[in-house]
Amino acid sequence: VSGIRGDALERFCLQQPLDCDDIYAQGYQSDGVYLIYPSGPSVPVPVFCDMTTEGGKWTVFQKRFNGSVSFFRGWNDYKLGFGRADGEYWLGLQNMHLLTLKQKYELRVDLEDFENNTAYAKYADFSISPNAVSAEEDGYTLFVAGFEDGGAGDSLSYHSGQKFSTFDRDQDLFVQNCAALSSGAFWFRSCHFANLNGFYLGGSHLSYANGINWAQWKGFYYSLKRTEMKIRRA
C-alpha cells in the first residue's frame, strides 16, 4: 500500500471505506449494499455500490425503480438521506458534500423508461458546495461539468450552480416554489430540465413537469421507470 495518502491509508487499514472505490479496492466487486464512512470512523452509512456498470466502483446516491418510497420530502430528509440502500433511496446532501470535498468525482446518471430502453449521461466533474464554509448555508450547490452523451442528452448542466430546493426551503430562481410545482426536490433553477426526485407517475402523464423527468430524453410529460445517480472518483 505504499504511496497511498495518509488518510486513505488509515481508512484502508481500518476497513472504513470512504466510498465504493475503497470498497472495490478491498476486493468486494459485486453489486450490493456496503457501509461507507464519509463523515468519519464513527458514522457508517449504508450505500448501494454499482460494481459492474462501466468498470464499477460507482457510489449510488439516488436510486428509484418502483415508486415504493416517497421523494416529495422536506429539507431535513434531503440533507440527511432517506430510504434504504437495498431499495429506493437518497444518500443525503451532507454525505454527498463530504464525499466530494475529499475526492474529485465524475457523475453518471442511468435512466430507464417503461419500454425497457436505457440511456445515460456522464459528467466528468461533480461536486456539492466544494468551496463553502458551511455547505448547508451554501444550499448544497451543485457543480457539474464535462457532459458526455449516452443517449439521454444533457438535462443537468442547466442546474449547475444552483442551490438545492425542497418544498419547505425554496432556494430556486423562480418566482414560485419549484419544488412544490414539480412535486420533488432538486437543484431547481427556473425550474428544471431534470426532475429525478419528482412523482413516480409511471410513464406518460398529463401533468406538466412533475414526474421523474429528464427533458432531453423523454420530455416533460414522461415519468421514468428507473433512475440512478452515481459517482466515482475521477
Epitope: 462501466e54 440511456a119 445515460y120 457532459f147 458526455e148
Partner: antibody
Framework: QVQLEQSGPGLVAPSQSLSITCTVS????????VHWVRQPPGKGLEWLGV???????NYNSALMSRLSISKDNSKTQVFLKMNSLQTDDTAMYYC?????????WGQGTSVTVSS | DIVLTQTPAIMSVSPGEKVTITCSAS?????MHWFQQKPGTSPKLWIY???NLASGVPARFSGSGSGTSYSLTISRTEAEDAATYYC?????????FGGGTKLEIK
C-alpha cells in the same frame, strides 16, 4: 458473448446507395446504443453516427443529408443506409456497441465504390 | 467540430522503452477514449473515460489528461504493442477521432 455481425454489398456503383446490416447478439438494443464508423483504405477512423436505445439518432453533420440509421429491436438488427455514394466513400464500414465508449466492434464491411 | 491532433504520427521504439502518445483537442473535452488497431482487424477499445483500461488491456498501459491535452503511456513497451492507436472524443457531436499514431517496435 457480445457479437456484432455485419453484412452488405462489397461493390456499389457511383451515385447508388449503400445498405449495411449489423446483427447483434449477446445484448439487447434496448440496453445499448450502436455506432457506425468507417475507415478509408490506409487512413484513419471517421465516426458516422449512432442510434440510441429509444431510436433517437445523432449523425456526423458532414454526412447527415445522405445518411440514415435505423433498427429493428425484435430482430436485433441495426441498419446503415447511405445515399449518393462517390469514390471517396470507399472504406471499411464498422458497427460498434456503446458503453463504455465503443466497447465491441463488428468485423467490418468492405465497400468499394466503382463503376 | 473538435479536431484531435495526435503526436507523433509514427514512432519506432525498442522493447522495454517507455512510450507516450499525446492527443491535443482544438477545444476542451470531458474525456478521451483510446483505441488500438492492428492491420486487417477491427479497432479495439483500449482506454475509456481518459484513464480506465478496457478489459484485457495490460497494466503497463495508462491514460491521463484533462481539458485539451491527453496522453496514452506504455511504461515498458512489448512487441505485441505494435499497432496504430487512435484517440476519440465524445464530448460534442460529431464525435471525432485523432489521425492515429503508428507504433513500431524495433
Amino acid at each position: 458473448q457480445v457479437q456484432l455481425e455485419q453484412s452488405g454489398p462489397g461493390l456499389v456503383a457511383p451515385s447508388q446507395s449503400l445498405s449495411i446490416t449489423c446483427t447483434v447478439s449477446g445484448f439487447s438494443l434496448t440496453r445499448y446504443g450502436v455506432h457506425w464508423v468507417r475507415q478509408p483504405p490506409g487512413k484513419g477512423l471517421e465516426w458516422l453516427g449512432v442510434i440510441w436505445t429509444a431510436g433517437n439518432t445523432n449523425y456526423n453533420s458532414a454526412l447527415m443529408s445522405r445518411l440514415s440509421i435505423s433498427k429493428d429491436n425484435s430482430k436485433t438488427q441495426v441498419f446503415l443506409k447511405m445515399n449518393s455514394l462517390q469514390t471517396d466513400d470507399t472504406a471499411m464500414y464498422y458497427c460498434a456497441r456503446d458503453d463504455p465508449s465503443m466497447a465491441y466492434w463488428g468485423q467490418g464491411t468492405s465497400v468499394t465504390v466503382s463503376s | 467540430d473538435i479536431v484531435l491532433t495526435q503526436t507523433p504520427a509514427i514512432m519506432s521504439v525498442s522493447p522495454g522503452e517507455k512510450v507516450t502518445i499525446t492527443c491535443s483537442a482544438s477545444s476542451s473535452v470531458s474525456y478521451m477514449h483510446w483505441f488500438q488497431q492492428k492491420p486487417g482487424t477491427s479497432p479495439k477499445l483500449w482506454i475509456y473515460s481518459t484513464s480506465n483500461l478496457a478489459s484485457g488491456v495490460p497494466a503497463r498501459f495508462s491514460g491521463s489528461g484533462s481539458g485539451t491535452s491527453y496522453s496514452l503511456t506504455i511504461s515498458r513497451t512489448e512487441a505485441e504493442d505494435a499497432a496504430t492507436y487512435y484517440c476519440q472524443q465524445r464530448s460534442s457531436y460529431p464525435y471525432t477521432f485523432g489521425g492515429g499514431t503508428k507504433l513500431e517496435i524495433k
